[in-house]
Amino acid sequence: ESLGTEQRVVGRVAEVSGPEPSQQEQLVFGSGDAVELSCPPPGGGPMGPTVWVKDGAGLVPSERVLVGPQRLQVLNASHEDSGAYSCRQRLTQLVLCHFSVRVTDAPSSGDDEDGEDEAEDTGVDTGAPYWTRPERMDKKLLAVPAANTVRFRCPAAGNPTPSISWLKNGKEFRGEHRIGGIKLRHQQWSLVMESVVPSDRGNYTCVVENKFGSIRQTYTLDVLERSPHRPILQAGLPANQTAVLGSDVEFHCKVYSDAQPHIQWLKHVEVNGSKVGPDGTPYVTVLKTAGANTTDKELEVLSLHNVTFEDAGEYTCLAGNSIGFSHHSAWLVVLPAEEELVEADEAGSVYAG
């Protein structure tokens, strides 16, 4: 990320280690509803013996809790039935499906399609605090260059409305604890620190509580000290591409720079049959450069639509800052549309329109 951009933690999508929990769902039920969770066997094969688990503990079947190998039913659900449910293989304890279930005190109502009903929804959730968008609370670690603005967010709800407070390394965190202070936006459940410095490194915990309970989330902040170097470009990007005539192609270039980088995309051209000028500098045309509303992220991608044979050739991502320049190049090969493409070379990708 470039200097001065705001780093937002909550909800920035993070890689999850281990098997991809593609079956994970976040579900909301009303009080009194029947919670029904189904977990079909992966790949349609035999299921084998399974066990249903809530918040780490095995579920005991009862008149209200009906447990089957592929399905779990919790009848007449209440707030206490909220939690993390998973279906696991009994022998290996491998998680087959995972569900985050929230039971609200408001019974789930039919959809008001045309929005005519202006009556207040009196079924406000009561009880202990909960994250209002739990699927966004998935990033725990943030590394940012010094001088950036950092925002931590922990949107929550409960009844009564919970309070939010912040800890740094387990201790109460207040504005006077850092030069430049902090901005606490309680309505937005956020903590903002501008122009972070290495001493801001640490664990930041939001504590959300009311009389019914408390929830907390901890984020680790690492502040990267400024190092005077030219931009670093991620190895292997942009990658060589092989494309079919008329298809779309994207080149990607990942730029790492403390000082604000300036990114350009260039295409190498020939002038009077020569690829380089008298001084050995290549002839290029600028395809993309920073504009008034262009973000660094947008500049890291070069999109070519409906490619022609004239688009074939060498493309360069050029990044510069106050210290110097770096560049990586890649080639685009354009093939006739009638050719059946099976695979590209090791470095390239195939786009078939």
């Epitope: 994970q24 976040q26 966004r136 709800a157 409305t161 937005q188």
Partner: antibody, heavy 118, light 107 residues
């Protein structure tokens, strides 16, 4: 520039299934969640659910959990929504829209018109 | 689910007027409200999020305000290109929900 390109209009019979695609370009697809929204003719917008392109984790509006399945193919930067057991009530324009953090849907696809009719 | 109510289905205005579109949530949404503009045959476009933060490239004649359950989108000096449908959305809690929309039209 950021673009979300959706598949074209579709006419399907009741009881059938359909899969709508949304190809993202101009940004790193794993940096944003992908949301899906339904707009019935002359009516408001309804949120169907979202998917985290990094790991495939989905969140559904309870109303659509038995109707829609969201998936993503990271390699082609394409999100998909499959709608099953279609009825005339499912005739609508469906949009994909990206979101970072909790900050609203900043870019939308052009919409896919689905007509369910025998 | 949180219900977002836009009490006016239509609002009449003239070019140059100041207009305020209101939206009421059925419960406190902690300023987690976005506003979208939709023109006929087009996709919605984000104007405002977190009640008052203007999205990149949105003209400064559009401002958002409000807290708790009551939110307002104000267009300071209406231009012809602002005649459109406006939706509020709460992006605070899942399931995310939208208002029914307010159509801004010429007097």
């Amino acid at each position: 520039e950021v673009q979300l390109q959706q598949s074209g209009p579709d006419l399907v019979k009741p009881g059938a299934s359909v899969k709508i695609s949304c190809k993202a370009s101009g940004y790193t697809v794993t940096d944003y969640y992908m949301n899906w929204v339904k707009q019935s003719h002359g009516k408001s917008l309804e949120w169907i659910g979202d998917i985290n392109p990094n790991n495939g984790v989905t969140t559904y509006n309870q109303k659509f959990k038995d109707k829609a399945t969201l998936t993503v193919d990271k390699s082609s930067s394409t999100a998909y929504m499959e709608l099953r057991s279609l009825t005339s009530e499912d005739s609508a324009v469906y949009y994909c829209a990206r979101e970072e953090d909790f900050d609203g849907f900043d870019y939308w696809g052009q919409g896919t018109t689905l007509t369910v009719s025998s | 689910d949180i219900v977002m109510t836009q009490s006016h289905k239509f609002m009449s205005t003239s070019v140059g007027d100041r207009v305020s579109i209101t939206c009421k949530a059925s419960q406190d949404v902690s300023t987690g409200v976005a506003w979208y503009q939709q023109k006929p045959g087009q996709s919605p476009q984000l104007l405002i999020y977190w009640a008052s933060t203007r999205h990149t490239g949105v003209p400064d004649r559009f401002t958002g305000s409000g807290s708790g359950t009551d939110y307002i989108l104000t267009i300071r000096s209406v231009q012809a290109e602002d005649l459109a449908l406006y939706y509020c959305q709460q992006h605070y809690s899942t399931p995310l929900t939208f208002g029914a929309g307010t159509k801004l039209e010429l007097k």
